[in-house]
């Protein structure tokens, strides 16, 4: 008795396809060993047609695949464009040779059955409508016209020209004639269901002189489209229901035993399980729409259906489209934290994965908004400026080639809590969802900047220090100047790192940045942060205002400085609209005066400078001759 199980017999018709599922026992060896499908010959030899090792025989080329689902302990053999030559005995099995564990499957492919020559076949999808054409002779023009549906014993009236209508067709069936043509009548039946399928007879007149026509109405449920997606990836259900339902509410539901539970609809309903990771997008006026789900979970696998109805709920007799979604746990998308926690006033560094083969793709970060049909406005991107309300506190750091980019958000408030998506303009499967939770801070922040009311005086020297706790001792500390194109890493000096003693003095750990001499372009947001290699950690931000030296000049408080930053940004946007050329991200040394200084800061500065994105120059035209940042000695 073989532990492999599957269908003993499979029958289909020419031109159609089959999907054969074979079940294997739940063991690690079985999950990873070779799966195969072979055809048994008269000699008892079984010739491999397809295997999970990538082998595909000539006769299956372009029309078959084999997919392993280790999480379900199954593998599926899909074969399309069947011919009668495919009839035969097969085995599905496991093992390095075709003599391993297997199950016998008999496949029979028959010819498409012939119908009597006088039968007209109408093939329609569920929810659609059909117009049946019923010809008759002129002498039957004044007679009663009718359409009836054949049952075992009799022919049950559907509709006739005396306006008699079967109760189950009220509001769905119409009998009419077109123009002055007195040799044909038509019956239209809308909102077709499976129960409408069957044989019909149209008739004009009575008795032996009556005109009759046989009609075979086939009502098809859409064959589910098979979707194979990786765990943590995303899926898009493209739904095309036709223009007759263009103005109806749209929905996507998931089959659950006896019902189809709505996941999302255009009336604002959304399943809480999909909060933060689903969008519904009407495409056009032809009834087309799409539903995008990110961060796929194992439990998302199942049978999905999209449809349209004024209620936004599944309704029999309305058009539908279906999918069978499989979620493969052997995913190429790395397992990242799906929840990131921060505290008010603090910061978060979110590592976003992307397809490493697409390192040059544009990276984005958007915030999922649940209102309406759901949308995800981009907050920052490699070629998208930071949204104004995130000024000074949001930046994207691209690390070309390593399959990750980092988004840092600081000065957190409880308003920032919510769902965010990492996405690129490349492989759409790599869209990932992060939930940001923000709790009220209960202790002092890890990084603190002094002085806190930072007002620098034009032409003078100005130093800011960033104090960090001993736990960050071994991490790389950095200062960067924020612009709406990124945060450009600057040369800085780590006071704590100079100490040769093994002990760590909590009070003396600081990293300083000096502006010498201070210029007007130095005004803006600066970040102090820690990182370990390419992994970014905490950050804190400070706004440095620049004032001319005046007698009795007073410090500007940070809120005024923030207001000024907003004004400055608005002015910059107005200016940049004058000349498109000036607004292009041209890689330039920015605050760095020479190559040596860039190298001193480390690889990150090189990467930032080269990318022209996250770490592109401030967008201010600075002279690099005399004014530059340098180490504080």
């Amino acid at each position: 008795k073989s532990p492999i199980f599957g269908p003993q017999e499979v029958s289909s018709i020419e031109g159609d396809s089959v999907s054969i599922t074979c079940y294997y026992p739940d063991t690690s060896v079985n999950r990873h060993t070779r799966k195969y499908w072979c055809r048994q010959g008269a000699s008892g030899m079984c010739t491999t047609l397809i295997s999970s090792n990538g082998y595909l025989s000539k006769e299956y080329s372009g029309r078959a695949n084999l997919i392993n689902f280790p999480e379900n302990n199954t593998f599926v053999i899909n074969i399309e464009q069947l011919t009668q030559d495919d009839t035969g005995s097969y085995k599905c099995g496991l093992g390095t040779s075709n003599r391993g564990l297997s199950f016998d499957v008999s496949l029979e492919v028959s010819q498409v059955p012939e119908l009597p020559s006088d039968t007209h076949v109408y093939t329609k999808d569920i929810g659609r409508n059909v117009t049946i054409e019923c010809p008759f002779k002129r002498e039957n023009a004044p007679s009663k016209k009718s359409l009836c549906k054949k049952t075992n014993q009799s022919c049950e009236l559907v509709i006739d020209s005396t306006e008699k209508v079967n109760p189950s067709y009220i509001g769905r069936a119409k009998l009419f004639m077109k123009g002055t043509d007195l040799t044909v009548f038509y019956v239209n039946i809308s909102h077709l269901t499976h129960n409408d399928a069957g044989l019909y007879i149209c008739q004009a007149g009575e008795g032996p002189s009556a005109d009759k026509k046989n009609v075979d109405l086939q009502v098809l449920a859409p064959e589910p489209e098979l979707l194979y997606k990786d765990l943590r990836s995303s899926v898009t259900f493209e739904c095309d229901l036709g223009r007759e339902v263009a103005n109806e509410a749209k929905y996507l539901c998931r089959m659950n035993k006896e019902t189809c539970d709505v996941i999302i609809n255009t009336l604002g309903k959304r399943d809480p399980d999909f909060e933060g990771r689903i969008l519904i997008t009407p495409k056009d006026d032809n009834g087309r729409f799409s539903v995008l789900i990110t961060g796929l979970r194992k439990e998302d696998a199942g049978h999905y259906q999209c449809g349209a109805h004024s209620s936004g709920l599944p309704q029999e007799g309305w058009p539908i489209q279906t999918w069978q979604l499989f979620v493969n746990e052997e995913s190429t998308i790395p397992n990242r934290r799906s929840v990131v926690k921060g505290v008010t006033g603090g910061s978060v560094a979110i590592a976003c994965p992307y397809n490493p083969k697409e390192s040059s793709s544009l990276k984005y970060w958007c915030r999922w908004e649940g209102d309406g049909n759901g949308h995800c406005p981009v907050l920052v991107g490699t070629q998208a400026q930071v949204q104004e309300e995130y000024e000074g506190r949001l930046a994207l750091f691209d690390q070309p080639g390593n399959g990750t980019y980092t988004v840092i958000l600081n000065q957190l408030t409880t308003e920032d809590a919510g769902f965010y998506w990492c996405l690129t303009n490349g492989d759409s499967r790599w869209r990932t969802t992060i939930e940001l939770q923000v709790a009220e801070a209960t202790r002092e922040p890890n990084l603190e900047v002094t002085p806190q009311n930072a007002t620098a005086v034009l032409g003078e020297t100005f130093t800011v220090s960033c104090h960090y706790p001993c736990k960050f001792y071994s991490q790389e500390k950095y200062w960067c100047k924020w612009s709406n194109k990124g945060c450009h890493i600057l040369p800085s000096h780590d006071e704590g790192a100079r100490q040769s003693s093994v002990s760590c003095d909590q009070s003396s750990q600081l990293v300083s940045m000096t502006l010498n001499p201070v210029s007007k372009e130095d005004e803006g947001w600066y970040w102090c942060g820690v990182k370990q290699g390419q992994t970014y950690g905490e950050t804190t931000a400070i706004y440095i205002a620049v004032e001319e030296r005046t007698r009795g000049s007073s410090h500007v408080n940070p809120t005024d400085a923030n207001a000024r930053a907003k004004v400055a940004l608005e002015e910059e946007v107005v200016d940049s609209s004058i000349s498109e050329k000036e607004n292009k991200a041209i890689p330039n040394p920015g605050p760095f005066a020479n190559e040596r200084e860039i190298q001193n800061v480390g690889d990150q500065a090189q990467e930032n400078r080269a990318s022209g994105d996250a770490g592109s120059a401030d967008g201010q035209s600075r002279s690099s001759s005399s004014k530059h940042h340098h180490h504080h000695h």
């Epitope: 199980f5 499979v10 029958s11 079940y23 199954t74 064959e223 006896e258």
Partner: nanobody, 127 residues
Framework: EVQLVESGGGLVQTGESLRLSCAAS????????MAWFRQVPGKEREFVAA??????????YSADSVKGRFTISRTSPKGETYLQMNGLKPEDTAVYYC??????????????????WGQGTQVTVSS
């Protein structure tokens, strides 16, 4: 929604035959799996056989214990489902249940995957 009614059970001698029928009323499906399970008091439901209709293709499954003796059939996606039982043995004595699931999902042998069940019909095989 969907009602399943079994018939055809009864008392037979070892080696005789019986034909069970399962009539479905209510909704009609084109993507459907129909199955027969059986249960002996105090034991779990045991898979007997199943048939799937998916588009124009049909898939037939049966348990090792009944292979070559029992045949499941279904005339059309809307027709009745039959279980032809030949060469009956005393160990085939049980209540036989008809089950259905649409759309077709999961392992046909797993009773949890079915969403519609009949009331059952008793089959007794005496020696």
């Amino acid at each position: 929604e969907v009602q399943l009614v079994e018939s055809g059970g009864g008392l037979v001698q070892t080696g005789e035959s019986l034909r069970l029928s399962c009539a479905a009323s209510g909704r009609a499906f084109s993507d459907l799996r129909m199955a027969w399970f059986r249960q002996v008091p105090g034991k779990e439901r045991e898979f007997v056989a199943a048939v799937e209709w998916r588009g124009s293709s049909r898939y037939y499954y049966s348990a090792d214990s009944v292979k070559g003796r029992f045949t499941i059939s279904r005339t059309s996606p809307k027709g009745e489902t039959y279980l032809q039982m030949n060469g009956l043995k005393p160990e085939d004595t049980a209540v036989y249940y008809c089950a259905a699931v649409s759309p077709v999902v999961g392992d046909p042998r797993n009773s949890d995957t079915y969403n519609y069940w009949g009331q059952g019909t008793q089959v007794t095989v005496s020696s």
